[in-house]
């Protein structure tokens, strides 16, 4: 999917409104040092773009996210405000409900959210210094 | 852990080509910018090139411009660079770096390398 | 194309601090990055974005950024601070990375 025609700020605010806290609420007595920043986005559709990937597609000891409360809201606000979205995740989310898994926190679950946070912080950052 | 290891330094004779590889491991590579960047014997940090995340752009410094060629294969996790029509003062470590960027800004130099040494000389 | 100079040499007495500066016409308008260098080893982020620290690098570096000159400050020296530090922008205008000279800190 090409995130290039969301509306980033209504995006902006669900992340801000709601999103950010359920990411704390998941990290919750994790220290914010303790991951290393291994994945980066370089403009707002690419954030959303490794946002998706990273909430939704179950990686090597980390099958579980996209049953958690901010990938809800998150799959929610990118339906609501990324025309055409919607369409493109029926099957995938067909697929997911009959992998369905044991909801478990790992290790590899909480470094994977670590860096959700800071997509998220970057697709909300201010402009950078233009020079 | 996140890493960055170079590769394919030595000795050649002036003129002739050398290629530098760059392997990454532990970071999604294909979201970064990445750099070479060179140390001449005794000397400060010279900036070479620049390739961004996608591959889709490339700037290099204007010491090494139509010489030197910067290509990545982000299915690989690798940097190269291609050296052509070397010269004495090209002698120097290269080191690979990456770097966060912000639509064409490229930010700070998070990761580098150990380097690999090349030196020019007949 | 943009320059940055920086003084070669800067002295600090173990447990004082040391001031490295950077400059650079309209400095301010960047982001400055500082590297530290040890000798036969690969170069160290300490502060970007001006001031901005990663989380591996010590409280005692700091770093502000206004007007034409970016400083680099390490309080409390210690011997293991001894090394050449870089400031660097990235220069949108040109669209090419600019380092600055190095400064060899030496703690006496």
């Known amino acids: 999917y090409d995130f290039t025609n969301c509306d980033f700020e209504k995006i902006k605010a669900a992340y801000l409104s709601t999103i950010s806290k359920d990411l704390i609420t998941y990290m919750s007595g994790t220290k914010s040092t303790e991951f290393n920043n291994t994945v980066s986005c370089s403009n707002r559709p690419h954030c959303l773009t490794e946002i998706q990937s990273l909430t939704f597609n179950p990686t090597a000891g980390c099958a579980s996210l996209a049953k958690e409360m901010f990938a809800m809201k998150t799959k929610a606000a990118l339906a609501i405000w990324c025309p055409g979205y919607s369409e493109t995740q029926i099957n995938a989310t067909q697929a997911m409900k009959k992998r369905r898994k044991r909801k478990v926190t790992t290790n590899k679950c909480l470094e994977q959210v670590s860096q959700l946070q800071g997509l998220w912080r970057r697709f909300n950052r201010p402009l950078l210094k233009q020079q | 852990q996140m890493q960055l290891v170079e590769s394919g330094g030595g000795v050649v004779q002036p003129g002739r080509s050398l290629r530098l590889s760059c392997a990454a491991s532990?970071?999604?590579?294909?979201?970064?910018?990445m750099h070479w960047v060179r140390q001449a014997p005794g000397k400060g940090l010279e900036w070479v090139a620049v390739i961004w995340y996608s591959g889709a752009y490339i700037h290099y410094a204007d010491s090494v411009k139509g010489r030197f060629t910067i290509t990545r294969d982000n299915s690989k996790n690798t940097l190269n660079l291609q050296m052509n029509s070397l010269r004495a003062e090209d002698t120097a470590v290269y080191y690979c770096?990456?770097?966060?960027?912000?639509?064409?800004?490229?930010?700070?130099?998070?990761?580098w390398g150990q380097g690999t040494m090349v030196t020019v000389s007949s | 194309s943009y320059v940055l100079t920086q003084p070669p040499s800067v002295s600090v007495a173990p447990g004082q601090t040391a001031r490295i500066t950077c400059g650079g016409n309209?400095?301010?308008?960047?982001?400055v990055h500082w590297y530290q260098q040890k000798p036969g080893q690969a170069p160290v982020l300490v502060v970007y974005?001006?001031?901005d620290r990663p989380s591996w690098i010590p409280e005692r570096f700091s770093g502000s950024n206004s007007g034409n000159t970016a400083t680099l400050t390490i309080s409390r020296g210690e011997a293991g601070d001894e090394a050449d530090y870089y400031c660097q922008v990235w220069d949108m205008s040109s669209s090419l990375v600019v380092f600055g000279g190095g400064t060899k800190l030496t703690v006496l």
């Open positions: 974005d001006d001031s």
């Open positions: 309209n400095l301010g308008s960047y982001s």
């Open positions: 532990g970071f999604t590579f294909r979201t970064y910018g």
């Open positions: 770096s990456r770097s966060p960027q912000w639509e064409d800004i490229f930010e700070a130099m998070d990761i």
